[in-house]
């Protein structure tokens, strides 16, 4: 009995031609909704003349429906038993699963103006970019539609730049006809328990972007994993979105759709400080927005990013240290709207449901040289937008996985 | 020890352009801006413009937008500036000098003095 | 732009004596002020950056204060090769300015 079951898994769950395993990872069969939340700034002016607390109210959620194309260029290599391939980007707006249209207007930090400011330190430089911020009438918080946001706008201070720079900006841009990757991971065909793990990425067993350990791509990329996945396991995957790999826990059991899955979660630890958790030393780069390295919460990934100060984090700042969150005003974290989940069915290894759910900010410093960053007195980690992306197994699939694997094995 | 070696002096004809150079030597040429100063009896001690050869970025004084351009060649540490449609009123000694905001340091060249003269 | 007001535009001061020049800013500069000295037929030389900070080799006789829009040029004890033309610049914000220049002569 067990030992079949066991042989049919082992077979089904191969990423190659002619398994359920492959067929569903190619294209996945689950629908995928990516929900964002903008934070509105209320007070933009207080901030940029007095250096207040900045009051931000959430708008959301704006709901698209992403991951809904196949991989492509999926390449078998029969010698080190891999498959390569490439992610596609798309995101289509769904109105129906939104508070608002993509033309709804926020008040947000001036992306432009916050990157140069940092990624060019030189106060000469500075001095030429204040010139071009005050000639295009430019200023610390912009006003923008959701579809100029996330997408990309091109912005009147960096059409001024008089040397080679990219004049689009957006926090997702470029996203639509671009392609994540290229992923190398393993078939499983000679080893199962390597099944889906990466082996390399962009042809790197490494980022470049972290020091030591950090660096490593660990894990799967989270859509599954090897089978007969143990509750004392700690799940390693990759996610090209924060630029690193991290872990997961398991926290419970729960009933999905009448199939027995595992709830694994990011536990807390995976974002405490080098002080509480000393194997995140190394993603600890720079020691004064750190205060040190004992801030916790906020993941500096400019080094991902081509220098612009962009911080990832849990929404609202959940798990993060107090002096983090302490400039903004109108945040409110709990585990349950805002921690990351993955639901596994464990026998195939597959992740039948999950909830990623991450915070994008933007680091703003004083400048004495840019007139519209010259009153503030502190440093600010920006919340800009905070996102939930989930997919759960539909109800046809649940049947058909039900009949299929859990139900033979009860 | 760090030294502006600026070009010889120059005799010109009134709408010729002119091209004054001042090779660095003795420090890291891109890390530092280069600025160019006008000086003649009548109106003192006038900057009119720098450039950071790290990047080709540079800021003019308005009143030299259109007469003068700064260029700088990283590979021989040279900073250029070309003065062009000359007139009387170019006739001056032209300084590069060096700085590193915030502080503004002591390296100025010998100077290039520029006679526009039929 | 900024207007850099020097005073006086000439004196006359003995031996030892205490010299001070000011300059005035249109606006606040921030304390981003240099003085230069510059002899008959020479390039001008930095003696003072961001108002009051000394170029090393510069004698310590010579000295800087102010803030917001009003600086001085201190020598506490004039010496004969300290005659010449001096001269404030901003460099707050573009374009950098210069002062007229005082010209200092020994009585």
């Known amino acids: 009995g067990d030992l079949l079951i066991q042989k049919t898994i082992k077979k089904q769950v191969v990423l190659e031609e002619g398994t359920i395993a492959f067929k569903n990872w190619v294209k996945t069969g689950t629908e995928v909704y990516r929900q964002f939340w903008i934070f509105d700034v209320q007070n933009p002016q207080e901030v940029m003349m007095n250096s207040s607390n900045i009051q931000v109210k959430q708008r959301g959620p704006y709901t698209y429906r992403v991951r809904f194309l196949a991989k492509e260029n999926v390449t078998q290599d029969a010698e080190d038993n891999t498959v390569s391939f490439l992610q596609p980007n798309g995101a289509i707006f769904e109105p129906s699963l939104s508070v608002g249209t993509e033309a709804d207007n926020f008040t947000v930090l001036n992306l432009a103006v916050a990157a140069a400011s940092h990624i060019y330190q030189n106060q000469f430089v500075q001095m030429i970019l204040n010139s071009l911020i005050n000639k295009s009438k430019s200023s610390m918080f912009q006003v923008r539609t959701l579809r100029e946001l996330l997408w990309g706008y091109r912005d009147p201070f960096l059409s001024l730049v008089p040397y080679p720079v990219t004049t689009t900006v957006g926090l997702f841009y470029p996203y639509n006809n671009t392609a994540d990757g290229v992923y190398k991971v393993f078939n499983g065909k000679d080893n199962i328990s390597k099944v889906a793990i990466i082996d390399t990425y962009k042809g790197k067993r490494n980022l470049s972007y972290w020091e030591s350990h950090c660096d490593m791509i660990n894990g799967t990329d989270a859509a599954s994993f090897p089978p007969f996945v143990e509750k004392s396991q700690v799940l390693q995957f990759f996610s090209s979105d924060i630029c690193r790999s991290i872990y997961a826990v398991f926290e419970s059991d729960v009933n999905l759709k009448g199939i027995p899955v595992y709830r694994f979660v990011l536990p807390s630890k995976a974002f405490a400080s080098p002080v509480e958790n000393p194997d995140n030393y190394c993603f600890c780069t720079e020691k004064i927005i750190s205060k040190n390295c004992t801030s916790y919460g906020v993941l500096d990934i400019s080094k991902c990013k081509e220098g612009r100060p962009v911080y990832i984090s849990l929404p609202h700042f959940l798990y993060a240290s107090p002096d983090v969150s302490e400039p903004i005003d109108g945040l409110n974290p709990n585990e349950e709207e805002h921690r990351t989940y993955l639901d596994i069915e464990p026998i195939t290894g597959f992740t039948l449901q999950f909830a990623k759910r991450l915070q994008v900010n933007l680091l703003v410093k004083p400048s004495e040289k840019i007139q519209v960053l010259k009153n503030l007195k502190r440093n600010y980690i920006v919340p800009i937008l905070w996102l939930n992306e989930t997919g759960t197994i539909g109800d046809e699939k649940a049947n058909m996985f039900r009949s299929q694997v859990t139900g033979k094995i009860n | 020890q760090a030294q502006l070696q600026q070009s010889g002096a120059e005799l010109v004809r009134p709408g010729a352009s002119v091209t004054l150079s001042c090779k660095a030597s003795g420090y890291t040429f891109t890390d530092y801006e280069m600025n160019w100063v006008k000086q003649t009896p009548v109106h003192g001690l006038e900057w009119i413009g720098a450039?950071?050869?790290?990047?080709?970025?540079?800021a003019y004084n308005q009143k030299f937008k259109g007469k003068a351009t700064l260029t700088a060649d990283k590979s021989s540490s040279t900073a250029y500036m070309e003065l062009r449609s000359l007139t009387s009123e170019d006739s001056a000694v032209y300084y590069c000098?060096?700085?590193?905001?915030?502080?503004?340091?002591?390296?100025w060249g010998q100077g290039t003095l520029v006679t526009v003269s039929a | 732009e900024i207007k850099m007001t020097q005073s006086p535009s000439a004196m006359y001061a003995s031996l030892g004596e205490r010299v001070t020049i000011t300059c005035k800013a249109s606006q606040d500069i921030n304390s981003y002020l240099s003085w230069f000295q510059q002899k008959p037929g020479k390039s001008p030389k930095t003696l003072i950056y961001r108002a009051n900070r000394l170029v090393d080799g510069v004698p310590s006789r010579f000295s800087g204060s102010g803030s917001g829009q009003d600086y001085s040029l201190t020598i506490s004890s004039l010496e004969f090769e300290d005659m010449g033309i001096y001269y404030c610049?901003?460099?707050?914000?573009?374009?950098?300015?210069f002062g007229g220049g005082t010209k200092l002569e020994i009585k």
């Open positions: 610049l901003q460099y707050e914000e573009f374009p950098y300015t």
């Open positions: 450039i950071d050869p790290e990047i080709g970025g540079s």
């Open positions: 000098t060096r700085s590193k905001l915030p502080a503004w340091f002591p390296y």
